[in-house]
């Protein structure tokens, strides 16, 4: 697994550097998770032809993956820092069940999948410290998540491969949209 943020050689080589600010820490954490997703996508794309498949709509119907929309306050038009932050945290919490699903989906990158999951939990904690309106954040229902997980795991092999591909693609996009918005804050 890659070295967690704050432990790379750049930091070691620059002892005079100021401690990371909250924003820098969040930025670094997202970039670390994106690295992990990139590695997982490599294995997925090498293993199957899902990355070139045009049948994504079939599997997408089963999934309710978080996505940024203009109403979420993260886009430049109608940008709202607090609304956007709530959307980012809520979205990450919703992704957690899908990241749990990914845990048994990789052979050579099993450690990487775990790192992505754990790093996302840490990112959520960082962001919760930044948010003022924690009451507006809705936590997914554990029972609903458990039945969703069971349903996803019961799919045939092709659908499971497609689901894995779609989760990684959507999570990457959500993180990139979050990264963009957070840098505007």
């Amino acid at each position: 697994a890659p070295v967690p943020p704050g432990e790379d050689s750049k930091d070691v080589a620059a002892p005079h550097r100021q401690p990371l600010t909250s924003s820098e820490r969040i930025d670094k954490q997202i970039r670390y998770i994106l690295d992990g997703i990139s590695a997982l996508r490599k294995e997925t794309c090498n293993k199957s032809n899902m990355c070139e498949s045009s049948k994504e709509a079939l599997a997408e119907n089963n999934l309710n993956l978080p996505k940024m929309a203009e109403k979420d306050g993260c886009f430049q038009s109608g940008f709202n820092e607090e609304t956007c932050l709530v959307k980012i945290i809520t979205g990450l919490l919703e992704f957690e069940v899908y990241l749990e699903y990914l845990q048994n989906r990789f052979e050579s990158s099993e450690e990487q999948a775990r790192a992505v999951q754990m790093s996302t939990k840490v990112l959520i904690q960082f962001l919760q410290k930044k948010a003022k309106n924690l009451d507006a954040i809705t936590t997914p229902d554990p029972t609903t998540n458990a039945s969703l997980l069971t349903k996803l795991q019961a799919q045939n092999q092709w659908l499971q491969d497609m689901t894995t591909h779609l989760i990684l693609r959507s999570f990457k996009e959500f993180l990139q949209s979050s990264l963009r918005a957070l840098r505007q804050m």
Partner: antibody
Framework: QVTLKESGPTLVKPTQTLTLTCSFS??????????VGWVRQPPGKALEWLAF???????YYSPSLESRLTITKDTSKNQVVLTMTNMDPVDTATYYC??????????????WGQGTLVT | DIQMTQSPSSLSAFVGDGVTMTCWAS??????LNWYHQRPGEAPELLVF???NLQIGVPSRFRGSGSETYFTLTINSLQPEDSGTYFC?????????FGGGTKLEI
């Protein structure tokens, strides 16, 4: 192979609207992390960023020109269009479109069009 | 807006020499700093992204460094084709801003 090409009028009268089209190939503007921006350069001067559009249709504009600029994309045609209203002689410049594409959104322009001089 | 300031505005050197130019950001931009080279009559070309990463195809005599507000671009063993203007760019947040440029004469 990534290519971008700007097209539009070379001569515009004061108060008129300038419409520039950036036609590109070799990448898709529906891929996450991808964006296309417009940058201009008056003769003998520095580069000035104008506008940027992302894969998900999020749009950003230069604050000093925001009221005059509109950027749109047509993903199926592989085109990005910039319109600039109320043109003035000080807007004389070479206008470039450029691509940005990386996982971390460094907003670095790795491919540029040849530029089009608008007077 | 984040202001980008480049220094010097111009410099001249001989083939084989080494030069360093600097770029300051008015506030911290982490490592979100890009460098471009532009020859007269041509479009800019990306040299370095994320402060220190060389773009594919760029010779290793180019080296970018720095973080937060202070960045440098060093060119070792100058070649005639290195002449032109070098621009730094804030890639952290919008509005994207460019420095005024450093004109290098070989």
């Amino acid at each position: 192979q990534v290519t971008l090409k700007e097209s539009g009028p070379t001569l515009v009268k004061p108060t008129q609207t300038l419409t520039l089209t950036c036609s590109f190939s070799g990448f898709s503007l529906s891929t996450s992390g991808v964006g296309v921006g417009w940058v201009r350069q008056p003769p003998g001067k520095a580069l000035e960023w104008l506008a940027f559009i992302f894969w998900d249709d999020d749009k950003y504009y230069s604050p000093s020109l925001e009221s005059r600029l509109t950027i749109t994309k047509d993903t199926s045609k592989n085109q990005v269009v910039l319109t600039m209203t109320n043109m003035d002689p000080v807007d004389t410049a070479t206008y470039y479109c450029a691509r940005s594409a990386d996982d971390y959104l460094y907003y670095s322009f790795d491919y540029w069009g040849q530029g089009t001089l608008v007077t | 807006d984040i202001q980008m300031t480049q220094s010097p505005s111009s410099l001249s050197a001989f083939v084989g020499d080494g030069v360093t130019m600097t770029c300051w950001a008015s506030q911290s931009i982490n490592d979100y700093l890009n460098w471009y080279h532009q020859r007269p009559g041509e479009a800019p070309e990306l040299l370095v992204f994320a402060a220190s990463n060389l773009q594919i195809g760029v010779p290793s005599r180019f080296r970018g460094s720095g973080s937060e507000t202070y960045f440098t671009l060093t060119i070792n063993s100058l070649q005639p084709e290195d002449s032109g203007t070098y621009f730094c760019q804030n890639g952290h947040s919008f509005p994207l801003t460019f420095g005024g440029g450093t004109k290098l004469e070989i």
